[in-house]
């Protein structure tokens, strides 16, 4: 999947398997990813679990778990608030699309959670305070967490320079992964730009991203997860400034 | 091994009035450099380990970003703390606890918020 | 919980071979350089060698340089120990253990070379 | 290499009474950015060892305060304050500063 991290930085992640997203004292939010297709390096997000720890007066320990094709509006004991302490309320799960759109609210740490379901595969967004970001009693155990410190290099697609090759070539190879041998030859480079342009008019890495998706999938349920994404962070980003983030001239090889 | 705590101080560091990417301020090359001297100071116990070269390519990634040179002044951290997780013994019958927003304008201006998102393939 | 699991000691002919693994448990072990250290019977800890979180490098003390290898597959969450030319100074209880230098230690496992 | 020489060897304590092993460094155990990088480990009898002090001084989770770790260069000191029944053991100390890494021979603490 793509990940933005708590620093903007933007990478493309072939993470395989349970990754922990977020881990600190108050939260824990783990995500497990597939391959999209079978031989293809690229994976996206199959389930997502969410960890709200015990805290104090406000909230009981919750656990949210979403899959393809179940994205409930209630934690897995079936509640929607924080249990049955005095500030309860300060934890609450809200179904805005069903089946498709859930919102968490955890006014008590000042985080919001935003959980789609996009075509087959799950989205994430979170809003969360850097003091709460950096709640960390165990860094060695705690503090290696994707959001924080982004996905690690043998794990990074160089998808800018496989957009660029594309761009030139036409070529629908993925750069640092192996082929995806079953993804529909009949999706060119140029619908791909057509199909992306129209929901992303911004030629930013979110774009870039979608038309990556398309190319390596030929699915095009990948343009709506870019543009659901940007608007997350459109709702979610304290820094209006930071919302596109753009191809970097001077960069790290295998860094987006 | 220690390098989280230099990403933990470094976050303090640059915990001012906007986020720390936007922030292209002699102030944040020098908690970059910090951020860079403290990461060499574990490299021994460290050096095997992802959190480490994560921060060395990240440090190079925000010096070449923020034009800061390598050479310059270095900064002290700001700490802040937040209330424990967990059950804490002081307990409070007021729900102002229970809203982050709140209990933070006691102690400070409005939070620094950061954003993290998963999507595609 | 972190938890260190070694395998694959026993008796071995001076100039055999065999193979340990240290399956890994509890934390992500894709993140951690990992080290070997052996215990003779009897005797006080030598450390064996290191390897990094992603195999980029491995480090080695002279007594075993060119016959032993480590190395790791995080897909699996398991550490390995090939050991070759088996001296009967090599007769130790080999212990894995995670970090770059050792925190969390396994409950070890005996190598004896004798003939 | 580096040489980790511990005193004493053996160390027989009384119960409640505090304990203090030695370990001398063969060369400067800090490098070049002022990072110093030695460790204690104890190993109870029919055990693993286990982290105590980790950089000099700082105490690993969950290893009870009455164990302190100090010194700098060459010299350093594993404190026990109020030696208790499970502290029975071998204590070793380890230097990270250098390749190849290395222990020191070990203190056997027993309890008088």
């Known amino acids: 999947p793509h990940l933005r991290t708590f620093t903007d930085r933007f990478q493309t992640c072939k993470v395989q398997g349970a990754w922990p997203l977020i881990d600190n004292n108050y939260l824990n939010v783990q995500v497990t990813n597939t391959p999209v297709l079978p031989g293809s390096a690229a994976t996206a997000t199959s389930k997502l679990t969410i960890i709200f720890k015990n805290f104090q007066e406000c909230v009981d320990q919750k656990v949210y778990q979403a899959e393809m094709d179940e994205l409930p509006a209630a934690f897995v004991d079936g509640s929607k608030n924080g249990g049955d302490k005095h500030g309860a309320n300060s934890l609450k799960i809200t179904e805005k699309v069903s089946g498709q759109h859930v919102e968490i609210q955890a006014k008590y740490i000042g985080t919001t959670i935003v959980v789609r379901q996009v075509g087959r595969y799950l989205t994430f967004a979170v809003r969360m305070p850097e003091e709460v970001v950096n709640a960390v009693e165990d860094w060695d155990s705690q503090g290696l967490y994707l959001c924080l410190r982004g996905c690690p290099l043998n794990q990074q697609i160089d998808f800018q320079a496989f957009h660029t090759n594309a761009e030139g070539t036409g070529a629908r190879r993925l750069a640092a992964a192996s082929p995806a041998p079953t993804a529909p030859e009949t999706f060119p480079y140029e619908t791909a730009v057509a199909k992306c342009k129209e929901k992303l008019p911004v030629e930013d890495l979110y774009y870039q991203a979608c038309v990556f998706d398309l190319l390596t999938t030929g699915d095009v349920n990948f343009t709506l997860a870019a543009y659901y994404a940007l608007e997350d962070v459109k709702m979610l980003h304290s820094n209006k400034d930071k919302l596109h983030l753009y191809e970097r001239t001077r960069d790290l090889p295998g860094r987006a | 091994c220690k390098i989280l705590k230099c990403n933990s101080e470094f976050w303090s560091a640059t915990s001012g009035s906007h986020a720390p990417a936007s922030d292209d301020t002699p102030e944040f090359c020098a908690a970059l450099r910090s951020y860079a001297l403290c990461t060499r100071r574990t490299a021994r116990t460290c050096r095997g380990d992802l959190a480490y070269h994560s921060a060395v390519h990240g440090i190079e990634d925000l010096m070449s970003q923020h034009n800061c040179s390598k050479d310059g002044p270095t900064s002290q951290p700001r700490l802040r703390t937040l209330p424990p997780a967990g059950d804490s013994q002081e307990r409070s019958d007021s729900p102002e606890i229970c809203h982050y927003e709140k209990s933070f304008h006691k102690h400070s201006a409005t939070p620094n918020y950061t954003h993290c998102g998963l999507f595609g393939d | 919980e972190v938890q260190l699991v070694e395998s694959g000691g026993g008796l071995v002919q001076p100039g055999g071979s065999l193979r340990l693994s240290c399956a890994a448990s509890g934390f992500t072990f894709s993140y951690y350089g990992m080290n070997w250290i052996r215990q003779a019977p009897g005797k006080g800890l030598e450390w064996i060698g290191m390897?990094?979180?992603?195999?980029?490098?491995?480090h080695y003390a002279d007594s075993v340089k060119g016959r032993f290898t480590i190395s790791r597959d995080n897909s699996k969450n398991t550490l390995y120990l090939q050991m070759n030319s088996l001296r009967a100074e090599d007769t130790a209880v080999y212990y894995c253990?995670?970090?770059?230098?050792?925190?969390?230690w396994g409950q070890g496992t005996m190598v004896t070379v004798s003939s | 290499d580096v040489v980790l020489t511990q005193s004493p060897l053996s160390l027989p304590v009384t119960l409640g009474q505090p304990a203090s092993i030695s370990c001398r460094s063969s060369?400067?155990?800090?490098?070049?950015?002022?990072?110093?990088?030695l460790e204690w480990f104890q190993q109870r009898p029919g055990q693993s060892p286990r982290l105590l002090i980790y950089?000099?001084?700082s105490r690993f989770s969950g290893v009870p305060d009455r164990f302190s770790g100090s010194g700098s260069g060459t010299d350093f000191t594993l404190k026990i304050s109020r030696v208790e029944a499970e502290d029975v053991g071998v204590y070793y100390c380890?230097?990270?500063?250098?390749?190849?890494?290395?222990f020191g021979q070990g203190t056997k603490l027993e309890i008088k």
């Open positions: 253990a995670k970090g770059t230098t050792p925190d969390y």
């Open positions: 060369q400067s155990l800090e490098d070049s950015d002022g990072g110093t990088f």
């Open positions: 390897i990094y979180y992603d195999s980029s490098e491995k």
């Open positions: 380890f230097q990270a500063t250098h390749d190849p890494l290395t």
């Open positions: 950089d000099v001084s």
